[in-house]
Interface confidence: low
Amino acid sequence: QLLEPCGYIYPEFPVVQRGSNFTAICVLKEACLQHYYVNASYIVWKTNHAAVPREQVTVINRTTSSVTFTDVVLPSVQLTCNILSFGQIEQNVYGVTMLSGFPPDKPTNLTCIVNEGKNMLCQWDPGRETYLETNYTLKSEWATEKFPDCQSKHGTSCMVSYMPTYYVNIEVWVEAENALGKVSSESINFDPVDKVKPTPPYNLSVTNSEELSSILKLSWVSSGLGGLLDLKSDIQYRTKDASTWIQVPLEDTMSPRTSFTVQDLKPFTEYVFRIRSIKDSGKGYWSDWSEEASGTTYEDRPSRPPSFWYKTNPSHGQEYRSVRLIWKALPLSEANGKILDYEVILTQSKSVSQTYTVTGTELTVNLTNDRYVASLAARNKVGKSAAAVLTIPSPHVTAAYSVVNLKAFPKDNLLWVEWTPPPKPVSKYILEWCVLSENAPCVEDWQQEDATVNRTHLRGRLLESKCYQITVTPVFATGPGGSESLKAYLKQAAPARGPTVRTKKVGKNEAVLAWDQIPVDDQNGFIRNYSISYRTSVGKEMVVHVDSSHTEYTLSSLSSDTLYMVRMAAYTDEGGKDGPEFTFTTPKFAQGEIE
């Protein structure tokens, strides 16, 4: 038994450029030839345990065999040289691992950053994958002095071991090396102070101003290498619920500062702020954003009066009428603070005013049948809104002028209403709506629209397949005009049930069918038409279509003494629904007819 290898493969650590050719040789030792009674022609080459085809092998002399591979693409191949000892037993002589890959590309896009309080980090693009162990070394030097090399762990970045020296230029480059080659990037020359990324500003605080409800004052602490650098700031803000940030113009924060007043804000609104900084020259990198800080602008008086309307209970000829004044709570954007109460002033045409302070959103008063003027203002701790004014005319006055061409239609999951204004100048419009039902009273909701509006959508939470009664009333300086109403659906559906048909009169050859309208709660849409299907037990089914305005229909040309089955369906724009089947029999003889 030979303890020494029987021979060797050269090269012993082959590394091949992908796509190129490669030749290896196996040299047998003399002692091996004699021990096993072999020569180089007995050599069998194998890659990953598979025999290499004979045409790739050349016997050079009695001790040496070569193998050639063309267009090497596998990343790693185990190559072995074997002999057939005594002509038949295969014995391994030597083995090597053949690697393939590419020489390193020239690294590009070399950039460096000095994170405040840390050493300098440089990054680069190594180019294409080499598939080989490749060492990347970050080199740096002054004109007169070399710095320690930085060996990259990941091949795309390296943090140097030394602290940067500011205000002196440094030269930096990357060397890449593997078994197939060595290459250097272009060098970059810079002052590390121009690559600083400051730590984020901290202790950001926000305070409001009682004098101005449109401003918030910010203050913060900047680092800037412990005061070595002058920093300029970048401030962004958003309302608490918004997702996008608003940018304070950079030209406003260019000079080094640690406080700033943000203007043109909405009153009584919570804002969130963040801030970052960079060297005032603009060189280097923006810091990360500071921790967010929030503040609320001071209250301001309400910016507009509430929507204001009234409802009158019929007086039945008495001297007094009950009037319910109603209004809507202001949205936050118009309340500009917490609404404490509402001031209602009622003035009769010839008498003194009566003032009411109300915390809710309605007030019921008993009024004589005279004309009244009602005004309404909302109050917060800063002050009162302007007043909304309503004229409540005498019940004996007939309302003139109403809107015309009133229409309602669904669009984009909203119920839209449009109209043509009356010929007289309008103060505002009131829209009222409720669900029509035979099972429950019509509970009204309402909204107010400016005089310039003639198309809007209902702003309540509307339900699908419910019939809405919508009323539009123009309001003039002298009081409300005439009201116009219509019905509309946010979204129609097929009816919940079909009509129940019955016979009103049955003759020998005809029958009068009758049915009731489907209750509004089951209609689920506008009933456009009906279909009547009728058949005998053996005949084919006949269908007639009837306009939705009818509640009767006469079937003619019927056979006498015959059982008929009838069913009706009702259709909306979204489909139909059958009612129950009904049967009737035609008589054998007409009235007065004898067999």
Epitope: T244, W245, I246, Q247, P249, L250, E251, G282, W286
Partner: nanobody, 125 residues
Amino acid sequence: QVQLQESGGGSVQAGGSLRLSCVISGFTYKQTFMGWFRQVPGKEREGVAAISTGGGSTVYADSVKGRFTISQESSKNTVYLEMNGLKLEDTGMYYCAASTVITSVTINRGLYQYWGQGTQVTVSS
């Protein structure tokens, strides 16, 4: 949602002119930065010009300085790119882009969040 729609591309002889338009909808126009970028197949998208819609300050790529002009019309929420003295190498797909959070006018494409579909510009000899 934010939408950018470019128009005005087409074919033109070298030395000729084109005017590209980009209409912005879906966010507050006055708080944005707008940029024009172009791309040739097989190459990275490169910045051409940018403008701050609030302050009107502009920046241009060296290759187009003096030939291209970026401008805006706030009332129409539109940004334009006037291209004069067109060269063969100006051929490519031109994209309009917008950013609401960058802090100064830049043609670094990585800082723009919103992009249009592009309009083709072809310059022939």
